[in-house]
Each structure stands twice: as C-alpha cells, then as structure tokens.
Interface confidence: low
C-alpha cells in the first residue's frame, strides 16, 4: 500500500483518522517539512522573551529578548541580564569585576588582563574593569622619547533593545 | 517574493534634509527588523542602525546617532531613514536591507537597490 | 566596535584557480554554536548578496565553489575553481553585537 503522507506538504499533517488526508495544521502549531503524521505546537515567546516572528503554519515562532537581556544558545533558547562593562552576572546579580580582571561586553564573565611579561613586553596602558592592559615594546625596547599608544575607545554593545 | 523598493536617487543642498524611502513587500513587514547601510562611491560598506516595525525600536551606530532617525509607516510597510544637517560627505548610495533571524543574531538577506544621494549646491 | 579587517585588499587570480580572502575580527564572534560571521558579494552598481551567512552555511542559491570557514577571530572565503562571473568586491560583516561592522572589502579580479 502505497504511503500517501509523504504527499502531504509542510503546513499539513497527514491525518491517519480521515484516511491518510493532509489536514491543515491547527492554530498555534506547525509542520516545516512535508509527510509529518503531527504538527510541532509553536514556541510561546513569553516572559524575558519577546516575539520576534510570528508562528506560521510552515514555521516556528522565533524569540528576541526584551530590553537589558541577550539572547543565550541555539536560536534564542535562554536570555541572559544583560550587566554593565566592567561587570560579570553571578547568581547574586551583577558584581564588578575584581582588580586583575575585565569585562568589555554586557554578557560574559570577567576576564584575567593580558600578562605582559609573558610575551616578554611591558604594560603601555594600565588595564581598568572595562579594558585589558594595553601591552608595549619590551622594556628593553623603550627608549626615551618613544611614542606611546592611546587605548581604543570603548566598545558599545546595546544590543537588539526595541523599547 | 521579498523585495524592498528603493527610490534611484535624490538631489539635496548642503545644510538640507531628505527623507528616503523603502517600501517592502513578499512578507510581514512587522516581524523582521529592516537596516540601512551607506556606501561612499567607491568606498565600503557602513552599518547606519536598524528599526522593529512592530514596535518601532531602534539602533543605531554611534557615528550616525544626529544624522539618521529611522521610523516606519506599517499601514504602508515602508520604512524611512531621515537624513539631515547634510554635506558632501553624506553623498553616498543608501541601501535598506531586511534581516533573518537566528538566536537572536541576524544576517541581511534581502536588499533595495540603493538610493544615490547627492548633495550639491 | 568590533573592526573586520579583511586581506588582501585586491585579489588578482586565474580563471579555475583558487581565491582565499580573510577577514580577522578584533574580538571572538563565536559561541559554542555559532559564529556570527557573513560574506557578501557586489558587483558594480548592484546591491551586496548575501554568499555565507554563519562562517560556514551556503546561502539558498549560491554556487557550491562558494565556501567559507573558521571561529573566534578568523574567517575565510574561498572561492574554487573561480569563473569570470566572480569578479567582484567581497565584504565580511559581523551580527554579533550592535553596531554591525563590515570589512573593508577585497576586490577580486580575474588575471
């Protein structure tokens, strides 16, 4: 007997209670291939997510974040507080970075400052909670009169934030 | 199909404003946010800023904070980038290009053909 | 903001040859997931296309000679063999924060 649900296309579900016919999803659900004996019930961006795109009959729901969070994982799966630069989130909320690290995004955790020495430099410019150190020539290379280098301007990362 | 409908070209005077055009159509205009990018003759490509129509948030690139208001008119599914206090060095081909979506980051898919200001006495 | 910077500048190469661009972030734009990294196409008087979105995933419609690759900081485009029809400015452009950036561009043309 010939499977006639592989005729079915995305949008429907082969319906095995009326003979093998493609019925049409049913609100808040979807099919994105075709030959599908159910429809996947659409994604609810509720909470700290916010509806990005509608759920079609063909296609699932898709999340943004609301205002001072980002999206974590495959396909907006999680959102994460956003913190300041200069700050990590922990489970008590946004802390301040400690002295010897940086943090120069709005997600992510503090980070240990470039070991100068290691390369055999110096630090040209001190590093600050928001900024790594700014590594140089190696002290021997310094002469005097030598140019020092200005740190780049601060990186800014608001993010999708419709308001 | 997604198209996004650009005007050719506006002719503005130094120290003027314009307002440009992009009218979208093929898809639901509120659900995919829609960004504009500057390209100088012969130059490369600038990221201006971005707008939700469904909500009407924005973004913009710090460099273009007091040049560029981007809004939307969702009964006509056009967006708008107003250009203002304009030189010569606002001259330049804008695009307006539509967004996808992934994990809440997004590459731009779809793109007008571009509308050449050029700012002249 | 994140600076793309994209090598070499011009890109003379052969027709069927192979035509390596790179591009080098100043910050990783990769998660365990994915790298928020694209390539685009433009030909004179025509708007950028979209080539590879996410490092590595081919767009709807572009040639298979079309690849890219790499995380964190490096990405690369190639282009083999490469045909007449290539000749083109490519650019690198990130999405993984606001400001989007793009690279400056590599000019590809054919020897």
């Known amino acids: 007997l010939q499977d006639l649900c592989s005729n079915c296309p995305a949008g429907t579900f082969c319906d095995n209670n009326r003979s093998q016919i493609c019925s049409p999803c049913p609100p808040n659900s979807f099919s994105s291939a075709g030959g599908q004996r159910t429809c996947d019930i659409c994604r609810q961006c509720k909470g700290v997510f916010k509806t990005r795109k509608e759920c079609s009959s063909t296609s699932n729901a898709e999340c943004d974040c609301i205002s001072g969070y980002h999206c974590l994982g495959a396909e907006c799966s999680m959102c994460e507080q956003d913190c300041k630069q200069g700050q990590e989130l922990t489970k008590k909320g946004c802390k301040d970075c400690c002295f010897g690290t940086f943090n120069d995004q709005k997600r992510g955790i503090c980070r240990p400052w470039t070991n100068c020495s290691l390369d055999g430099k110096s630090v040209l410019v001190n590093g600050t909670k928001e900024r790594d150190v700014v590594c140089g020539p190696s002290p021997a290379d310094l002469s005097p009169g030598a140019s020092s280098a200005t740190p780049p301007a601060p990186a800014r990362e608001p993010g999708h934030s419709p308001q | 199909q997604v198209q996004l409908q650009q005007p050719e070209s506006e002719l503005v005077r130094p120290g003027g404003s314009v307002k440009l055009s992009c009218k979208a159509s093929g898809y639901t205009f509120t659900s995919y946010w829609m960004d504009w990018v500057k390209q100088r003759h012969g130059q490369g490509l600038e990221w201006i800023g971005n707008i939700y129509p469904d909500s009407g948030g924005t973004n913009y690139a710090e460099k273009f904070k007091s040049k560029a208001t981007l809004t939307v008119d969702t009964s006509s599914s056009t967006a708008y980038m107003h250009l203002s206090s304009l030189t010569s060095e606002d001259s330049a081909v804008y695009y307006c290009?539509?967004?996808?979506?992934?994990?809440?980051?997004?590459?731009?898919?779809?793109w007008g053909q571009g509308t050449l200001v050029t700012v002249s006495a | 903001d994140i600076v793309l910077t994209q090598s070499p500048a011009s890109l003379p190469v052969s027709l069927g040859q192979r035509a390596t661009i790179s591009c080098r972030a100043s910050q990783s734009v990769s998660t365990s997931s994915y790298s928020y990294m694209h390539w685009y196409q433009q030909k004179p008087g025509q708007p950028p296309k979209l080539l590879i979105k996410y490092a590595s995933n081919l767009e709807s419609g572009v040639p298979a000679r079309f690849s890219g690759s790499g995380s964190g900081t490096d990405f690369t485009l190639n282009i083999h063999p490469v045909e007449e029809e290539d000749t083109a400015t490519y650019y690198c452009?990130?999405?993984?924060?606001?400001?989007?950036?793009f690279g400056g561009g590599t000019k590809l043309e054919i020897e």
């Open positions: 452009q990130h999405s993984w924060e606001i400001p989007y950036t």
């Open positions: 290009t539509r967004e996808e979506a992934l994990g809440g980051y997004y590459e731009l898919t779809y």
